[in-house]
Structures are given as structure tokens and as C-alpha cells.
Amino acid sequence: LQDPCSNCPAGTFCDNNRNQICSPCPPNSFSSAGGQRTCDICRQCKGVFRTRKECSSTSNAECDCTPGFHCLGAGCSMCEQDCKQGQELTKKGCKDCCFGTFNDQKRGICRPWTNCSLDGKSVLVNGTKERDVVCGPSPADLSPGASSVTPPAPAREPGHHHHHHH
């Protein structure tokens, strides 16, 4: 015997107490598949969340984050504060990247500059809080007679060294 509830389309629920009739989901609820005995309560995008897609009778609302925040987790289950490039978010708020590290995004952690010497290369462009170092050709490639690259002026940070990590 076919389950009478299987005839109930998405956007309805099969009402056990009403001889399996298909009742529409009430406002702010939905069923995304047919044959459901319940409707799901719509997600509400409140506070730091904002509505990216309205709930319908057949699909849930989708949230993103208000400006200054970004989504974390599956389906944007959390909003996390943005920081500036050159910073990372700590328990005490946004903090500048330590010397020798950088972050080129508004989210995430500060990462150590690339150590060019590990690849046998030289530093072509110094790193900053916002940008990684740019590695250039190996020092051997800069032998006299080869087209030389003038090394850039050091960044205006005292004792700017490229192998320091914190």
C-alpha cells in the first residue's frame, strides 16, 4: 500500500491528525521535500546576520554577515569580525601582525614571511605586515656580468630581518 503522505508535495506537511491530508506549511516554515510529516522552522537572520535569501515554503532562509563581519561555519552559522590587512583577530580584538609575519586578508591569522634562503633564493621585495616577501633569483644568479637586479631599499623598520619569526 502506498503511504498517503507520499502525495504531499514540498511546502506542505502530512497531517496525521487530519486523516493524512496535506496542509500547507505556516508562514516562516518550510518543507523542502514531499511526504514530510512536519515543516521546519525558517532560520531567522538577526543581529549581525542579514538575510541573503528569504525563506520560502520549500526552502530555508540563507544568512550572511553585516558589513565588517564575515561568515564562518557551514551555512554561515557564525559571523566573525573583520580585521584590516596586516592584522589578525585575537581574544582582545584585532592586533597587528608581529614582525616577520603578514596577513593579506581581512580574516585569518598572520603567517610567517617566506624564507627565501630555504629555496636558495634572495629577497627581491621585503615583506610587510600586509604582504609576504617576494623571492628573487638565487644569489649565484647575480654574478658579475649577469644582468644585475638592484636590491630594493630596506623597509623603514629598524633591524628589518627576514628570518625572524615570533
Epitope: F13, R37, D40, Q44
Partner: nanobody, 120 residues
């Protein structure tokens, strides 16, 4: 942690009315359907009804004697019970869920219950 606290139970005579209240602390009812269940001594738990977004769904035994309503300002849900009968004697539980109706679901949270006795 969500806490649901029922109140308003007591002993009444057949034909009388009672209004049960369910107050939520730790979270508002905004995002949840609110339901009522009841359990009489020695019997299985019985679904009474669910309220969500202005709509109420009821179990199949009330014959329009029970009405669920909600006061958002007070973060409280009510179960109005009229023309009470001795067979309505039970512990009444308030519950919340992300499903509507709650006839076939296990609630996310449930209160401790309030006793209703209908006796002459």
C-alpha cells in the same frame, strides 16, 4: 541553557476552565514552535498542540476545547483549556522545537510540567 517553566495547574471541577502558562528563560520563543503535551498516570504521553507564527495545530482529542496562544512581549505561551473533563487529568508539559507541528517529533527542550486535576 533554555529553561521552560509551566504554571497555572491545579484542581478544578468538570466543566471548569484553566489557563496554563509557559515562560522561557535563556532564549526567546522567536525561533521556535511551542507545543504542549500531557501525560496521565500510567498512560503514554499525548500530543496536545503546537503554535507557530500565528497558526495552531491540535491533537485529535480536544474538540475545540483547547486553545494555544502566545504573548511575544512576555515571552510566554498559553494553553487555554475549557469545559475540562476528568480524562483531562494529567501533567501538562510545554516544549519547543524547530519542527511544526510537534505531533510526531521529540522536542528540543521540555519543561518540568504542571499538574492538572479535574475532579468533582
Amino acid at each position: 541553557q533554555v529553561q521552560l517553566v509551566e504554571s497555572g495547574g491545579g484542581t478544578v471541577q468538570p466543566g471548569d476552565s484553566l489557563r496554563l502558562s509557559c515562560a522561557a528563560s535563556g532564549r526567546t520563543f522567536d525561533n521556535y514552535a511551542v507545543g504542549w503535551f500531557r501525560q496521565a498516570p500510567g498512560k503514554e504521553r499525548q500530543y496536545v498542540g503546537t503554535y507557530w507564527s500565528g497558526y495552531a495545530h491540535y491533537g485529535d482529542f480536544e474538540n475545540n476545547r483547547f486553545t494555544i496562544s502566545r504573548d511575544n512581549a512576555k515571552n510566554t505561551v498559553y494553553l487555554q483549556m475549557d469545559n475540562l473533563k476528568p480524562e483531562d487529568t494529567a501533567v501538562y508539559y510545554c516544549a519547543i522545537s524547530l519542527k511544526y507541528p510537534m505531533a510526531t517529533v521529540t522536542p528540543d527542550y521540555q519543561g518540568q510540567g504542571t499538574q492538572v486535576t479535574v475532579s468533582s
